[in-house]
Amino acid sequence: TMAIWRSNSGSNTLENGYFLSRNKENHSQPTQSSLEDSVTPTKAVKTTGVLSSPCPPNWIIYEKSCYLFSMSLNSWDGSKRQCWQLGSNLLKIDSSNELGFIVKQVSSQPDNSFWIGLSRPQTEVPWLWEDGSTFSSNLFQIRTTATQENPSPNCVWIHVSVIYDQLCSVPSYSICEKKFSM
């Protein structure tokens, strides 16, 4: 069953088909409402004054998932918990189409990096998606940022069109993904 999210609240202004977020920086552990406020402007469909979509307000729909580009800074673990609060997980990239969609979205913010749902305990153990599935480098390569000073970048973020490993404690933005079934 597919949940349909309807919203006609005035919490965000609908202008030229875009949600205009208030873009508040939130460096503390956010509440659910502040999480949903802290997102990039996203395209929405207007239907007779009420928005009808399988995604909540402020989320972008692509194929069978809803995506939230969170603009609150947090560690990888904190970002993971933010997504959980919203009933979702950090982004898992399943296909080249999905990767292309994500790259297109984040490339519009060249100053920002976004955590995705890939991590590992340490360099000797393979990368693992948050849901426990294996990572295949056939889809994309992870460019390392390891140095002598920071030898253990064990979480992954995307910056423009490149995917990097990074220290999990570094504050960054994030991408939440909520899969839906038709």
Partner: antibody, heavy 118, light 107 residues
Amino acid sequence: QVQLVQSGAEVKKPGASVKVSCKASGYTFTDYYMHWVRQAPGQGLEWMGWINPNSGGTNYAQKFQGRVTMTRDTSISTAYMELSRLRSDDTAVYYCARNSGSYSFGYWGQGTLVTVSS
Amino acid sequence: DIQMTQSPSSVSASVGDRVTITCRASQGISSWLAWYQQKPGKAPKLLIFGASSLQSGVPSRFSGSGSGTDFTLTVSSLQPEDFATYYCQQAYSFPFTFGPGTKVDIE
């Protein structure tokens, strides 16, 4: 729903080999590591290793290196664990377990009792 | 190999009691720790992963905490079906290793 169904109990003589199967259903078999864990009677749990069903790559605990072989048949979504040169202290229940978040074991087979006795 | 120790090795408790089990790793494992419940003749069941994340379908009376070397599993109000053996498991480095178990039985 995710299900792991293992082959039946085996009785083996010391020095022989045993091959245990684990048939997976309810998810995409090639997407998740399959672990093997054993438990001797009245004892705790011991991780033996894993197989990546997608690539066939394996990672074995040092203790079992040279004696254990993990394989898979993706056409029938089945993982196998073969242990050779059996000793009496290999008597245990052998479990397959599907990987979950943070390298935990979220789904388990029902277990296969392997008895090694002369 | 990383050694995992658990305490106590066994505990007697009554229905409604709050029960706390501790697990200690011989070196830091960040939050790469899971907790399992096992009943006699059955396969283990995952309760907690990532040190504090509750597995789907597990009652909220179970909670996990800790990071680094010291971890805790708490059952806030013990139910009859909770009498079992509990194991911790580290997933920080190979080989993955389990604690020796803590048996929770009826007082």
